[in-house]
C-alpha cells in the first residue's frame, strides 16, 4: 500500500493540486492527530486554512478551554479549529493571518497581519501579531501586546472582571479589549448597542454585532 | 546598510499612467512595510498609501479612489508604485519609505526614504 | 479623515534658543490598547527627503540629537529643540498614524532670525 499523503495546512493542499474550496483533512508532521478544516482556495491565491467562522448563530461559541483547544463546530458552517493544533502549526513556519468581517450593511473588511502565532497551551494560547495592514482599521483590534486566550472556565484576561463570562466567547482579551470575534451573534436589527456581541472595534465601534466573521491563515512564503 | 533606490523622474501625458520602483537593499524586504508619500511642489506631504511585500497587503488613500495600485515583488525586494489617470495636480516628487512593525503594535515611523522621484505632468 | 494642524506656520528663532513647535489633531490619537499616541515628527529641507526625528510621540529615533523632545498625547502635541544648531532650520511635519489616510500637518517652517 502506497504512503497516505498528508497535509498540514490548505496551503500544502493548494500545492498538490486540490483547488476547490471545501473541508480537507490536516495533519501536522511527526502526528497522528487530525483535523477537519475548511479550505478557501479562491480567495486571494488560495491556500487559506479558516480557523474561525461566524455567519448565522448555529454554533454557541460559549465554549469550555478544552473545546476551543481541540475545536468544535462544522467546518462547512461556524466553528473554531482549535487552539492546539493552530498553535503548533504556526510555530513550525511563519504564517499570516487575514480576519475578514462583514456588517449588516453589506459592507466588508478586513485586517491583515504580517506574521501571526500562538503560543502554547502551557502559556495560555497567548497570540503574537506583527504588521497590519487592511481596511478594518488602522490600529488592531486585537490588543497589542498580545494577551493569553481566556475562557467561561479560564480566566487569564487582566480585567477584575471575567471577560469571557461577562462578554461570552473565548478569546484573547485585554481588559477586556476592542474585539471578541466569538461574542454572541445576534440577527439584524438587533446588533446594535450590544456589549457582548460580535465586535471589532475599529472597524464599526464598541456596541456593533457583526454579520459575519472568518479567520484565516497561511504561510507567509505562499 | 539600508537603501531604498527608486526609479528616474518621468514625464506622462495627462489621462496616461506612471509606474514608479522602489528597490530595498540592507535588509529583510518581508519585514517592513513600504509606505509611498508625495509632495507636490512648494507642497506638503500626503500619503498615498502602503504594502506589506510579505503578503502583498495593502492599504490606500481612498482620496485617489482606485487610481493607485502598490505592489511589491519579493523575488527582486522591489516594491512599485502606479497611478493612473494621471492629472496636471498630479505632478509631484513621490517617495517611498520603510516603515518598522513589530509585536507589541507600537508606531515606528517611517525611518528610511528613497530619493524621490519627480513626475510631471504636462500636455 | 483626521486633520492636522501645525503652528506656528513659520517660527523665527535664533542659533542657541529653545524652538516649540505645535501640532493638533482633529480626534485622539491614542491607542485604546496601549495608550500610546500614533503621532510621529519628520524633518525636511530643501531637495532631501523627510528625516524621522520622533515616534510615539515622545520616542526619538535613533542617531537624532538629544536636543529633540517630543511630548503630548491625544490631541495636542509639542517638538522642542532646546538649543537650535544650524543645521536644525528645516520644515517639520507632524503625522497621523491612528487611522486611515495617514495625514501630515501642513509644515512648521523653522528659520533663522
Known amino acids: 500500500k502506497g504512503e497516505q499523503i498528508s497535509f498540514r495546512d490548505c496551503a500544502e493542499v493548494f500545492k498538490s493540486g486540490h483547488t476547490t474550496n471545501g473541508v480537507y483533512t490536516l495533519t501536522l508532521p511527526n502526528s497522528t492527530e487530525e483535523v477537519k478544516a475548511y479550505c478557501d482556495m479562491e480567495a486571494g491565491g488560495g491556500g487559506w486554512t479558516i480557523i474561525q467562522r461566524r455567519e448565522d448563530g448555529s454554533v454557541d461559541f460559549q465554549r469550555t478551554w478544552k473545546e476551543y483547544k481541540v475545536g468544535f463546530g462544522n467546518p462547512s458552517g461556524e466553528y473554531w479549529l482549535g487552539n492546539e493544533f493552530v498553535s503548533q502549526l504556526t510555530n513550525q513556519q511563519r504564517y499570516v493571518l487575514k480576519i475578514h468581517l462583514k456588517d449588516w450593511e453589506g459592507n466588508e473588511a478586513y485586517s491583515l497581519y504580517e506574521h501571526f502565532y500562538l503560543s502554547s497551551e502551557e502559556l495560555n494560547y497567548r497570540i503574537h501579531l506583527k504588521g497590519l495592514t487592511g481596511t478594518a482599521g488602522k490600529i488592531s483590534s486585537i490588543s497589542q501586546p498580545g494577551n493569553d486566550f481566556s475562557t467561561k472556565d479560564a480566566d487569564n484576561d487582566k480585567c477584575i472582571c471575567k471577560c469571557s463570562q461577562m462578554l461570552t466567547g473565548g478569546w484573547w482579551f485585554d481588559a477586556c479589549g476592542p474585539s471578541n470575534l466569538n461574542g454572541m451573534y445576534y440577527p439584524q436589527r438587533q446588533n446594535t448597542n450590544k456589549f457582548n456581541g460580535i465586535k471589532w472595534y475599529y472597524w464599526k465601534g464598541s456596541g456593533y454585532s457583526l454579520k459575519g466573521t472568518t479567520m484565516m491563515i497561511r504561510p507567509a512564503g505562499f | 546598510q539600508v537603501q531604498l533606490v527608486q526609479s528616474g523622474a518621468e514625464v506622462k501625458k495627462p489621462g496616461s499612467s506612471v509606474k514608479v520602483s522602489c528597490k530595498a537593499s540592507?535588509?529583510?524586504?518581508?519585514?517592513?512595510?513600504i509606505n509611498w508619500v508625495r509632495q507636490a511642489p512648494g507642497q506638503g506631504l500626503e500619503w498615498m498609501g502602503k504594502?506589506?511585500?510579505?503578503?502583498?497587503?495593502?492599504s490606500s488613500n481612498e482620496k485617489f479612489k482606485g487610481r493607485v495600485t502598490i505592489t511589491a515583488d519579493k523575488s527582486t525586494s522591489t516594491a512599485y508604485m502606479e497611478l493612473s489617470s494621471l492629472r496636471s495636480e498630479d505632478t509631484a516628487v513621490y517617495y517611498c519609505?520603510?516603515?518598522?512593525?513589530?509585536?507589541?503594535?507600537?508606531?515606528?515611523?517611517?525611518?528610511?526614504w528613497g530619493q524621490g522621484t519627480l513626475v510631471t505632468v504636462s500636455s | 479623515e483626521i486633520v492636522m494642524t501645525q503652528s506656528p506656520a513659520t517660527l523665527s528663532v535664533s542659533p542657541g534658543e529653545r524652538a516649540t513647535l505645535s501640532c493638533k489633531s482633529s480626534?485622539?490619537?491614542?491607542?485604546?490598547?496601549?495608550?500610546?499616541?500614533?503621532l510621529a515628527w519628520y524633518q525636511q529641507k530643501p531637495g532631501q527627503a523627510p528625516r524621522l526625528l520622533i515616534y510615539?510621540?515622545?520616542t526619538r529615533e535613533s542617531g537624532i540629537p538629544a536636543r529633540f523632545s517630543g511630548s503630548g498625547s491625544g490631541t495636542e502635541f509639542t517638538l522642542t529643540i532646546s538649543s537650535l544648531q544650524s543645521e536644525d532650520f528645516a520644515v517639520y511635519y507632524c503625522?497621523?498614524?491612528?487611522?486611515?489616510?495617514?495625514?501630515f500637518g501642513q509644515g512648521t517652517k523653522l528659520e533663522i532670525k
Open positions: 519609505a520603510r516603515e518598522a512593525f513589530d509585536y507589541d503594535g507600537d508606531y515606528y515611523g517611517m525611518a528610511y
Open positions: 504594502i506589506g511585500p510579505g503578503s502583498g497587503s495593502s
Open positions: 503625522q497621523n498614524d491612528h487611522s486611515y489616510p495617514i495625514t
Open positions: 540592507g535588509y529583510i524586504f518581508i519585514d517592513y512595510f
Open positions: 480626534q485622539s490619537l491614542l491607542s485604546s490598547g496601549n495608550q500610546k499616541s500614533f
Open positions: 510615539g510621540a515622545s
